[in-house]
């Protein structure tokens, strides 16, 4: 079952997600999506990183931590009840079926 996180309407929500950088030091691409993690990729992508940068995002979503050191925790600004639900943090490790997938449940009250 998903780990549950709570936030109040009008506040910022925080969904933690971390990974350990490979010994090469290069970043692993990460995607965040609304909805449980599918077999591949992320559904309804709200944010994505590549080898160096955040390269896709939608307006209320950002990574406030040091994502270049493996802290890819998601912040959602000014949440509403519509933001409730499951979010997927997917660490896209190279290779077949190597991805790390984390489903996080956000409850807005």
């Amino acid at each position: 079952s998903e780990v549950e996180y709570r936030a109040e309407v009008g506040q910022n929500a925080y969904l933690p997600c971390f990974y350990t950088l490979p010994t090469s030091g290069t970043l692993v691409p990460v995607c965040w999506g609304k909805g449980a993690c599918p077999v591949f990729e992320c559904g309804n992508v709200v944010l994505r990183t590549d080898e160096r940068d955040v390269n896709y995002w939608t307006s209320r979503y950002w990574l406030n931590g040091d994502f270049r050191k493996g802290d890819v925790s998601l912040t959602i600004e000014n949440v509403t009840l519509a933001d409730s639900g499951i979010y997927c943090c997917r660490i896209q490790i190279p290779g077949i079926m190597n991805d790390e997938k984390f489903n996080l449940k956000l409850v807005i009250k």
């Epitope: 080898e51 955040v54 390269n55 995002w57 950002w62 406030n64 931590g65 040091d66 994502f67």
Partner: antibody, heavy 114, light 108 residues
Framework: QIQLQQSGPELVTPGTSVKISCKAS????????INWVKQRPGQGLEWIGW????????KYNEKFKGKATLTVDTSSSIAYMHLSSLTSEDSAVYFC???????WGQGTTLTVSS | QIVLTQSPAIMSASPGEKVTLTCSAS???????LYWYQQKPGSSPKLWIY???NLASGVPARFSGSGSGTSYSLTISNMETEDAASYFC?????????FGGGTKLEIK
């Protein structure tokens, strides 16, 4: 100590191209990104793109795609920026900056004039 | 892309005065990658504050930085003559990296 030494000023005519260099010293060149930044006279700063010397991978600001080409010569620890089809809008000071924007070159002044 | 809006564009302050420069982002950015630079005419930008609140080497303790998400600021607790310069905020978390338009700080 870390240093980024850029090539000297350039005066060129419209329609031509130019190649600006940035020689790095004081660190392992292939381990860190190099960024390029444009500054028009009396104006703000614009990021052009980065290159990772270890792999040659590049990323460009969409605005500068087709205008700037970033390359490196790892044997001499030099990063280059080639600017093509020059117009007066390209007249500016161009800076190279280190991986984390903590070290900057002294800037290269490019003047495009007929 | 993320637009960084700095205000005011130009301001003057007397020696000893407290000065606050602001930088507003159109979307949230990582506080780890929100930087401030000082630039004087004819010189390269100098890293002044990194990761929102950390002073670069050699920067006087009268400078401080704060903020998160979409709102950041640089404060000088007591203005000195040598602080007259342009200050730029910069985010390099989201590609393309962007800079604010700058604040030109003058001495009264």
């Amino acid at each position: 100590q870390i240093q980024l030494q850029q090539s000297g000023p350039e005066l060129v005519t419209p329609g031509t191209s130019v190649k600006i260099s940035c020689k790095a010293s004081g660190y392992t060149f292939t381990d860190y990104y190099i960024n390029w930044v444009k500054q028009r006279p009396g104006q703000g700063l614009e990021w052009i793109g980065w290159i990772y010397p270890g792999s040659g991978n590049t990323k460009y600001n969409e605005k500068f795609k087709g205008k700037a080409t970033l390359t490196v010569d790892t044997s001499s620890s030099i990063a280059y920026m080639h600017l093509s089809s020059l117009t007066s809008e390209d007249s500016a000071v161009y800076f190279c900056a280190g991986d984390r924007f903590d070290y900057w070159g002294q800037g290269t002044t490019l003047t495009v004039s007929s | 892309q993320i637009v960084l809006t700095q205000s005011p564009a130009i301001m003057s302050a007397s020696p000893g005065e407290k000065v606050t420069l602001t930088c507003s982002a159109s979307s949230g950015v990582s506080s780890s990658y929100l930087y401030w630079y000082q630039q004087k005419p004819g010189s390269s930008p100098k890293l002044w504050i990194y990761s929102t609140s950390n002073l670069a080497s050699g920067v006087p303790a009268r400078f401080s930085g704060s903020g998160s998400g979409t709102s950041y600021s640089l404060t000088i607790s007591n203005m000195e003559t040598e602080d007259a310069a342009s200050y730029f905020c910069h985010q390099w978390s989201n590609s393309p990296y962007t800079f604010g338009g700058g604040t030109k700080l003058e001495i009264k």
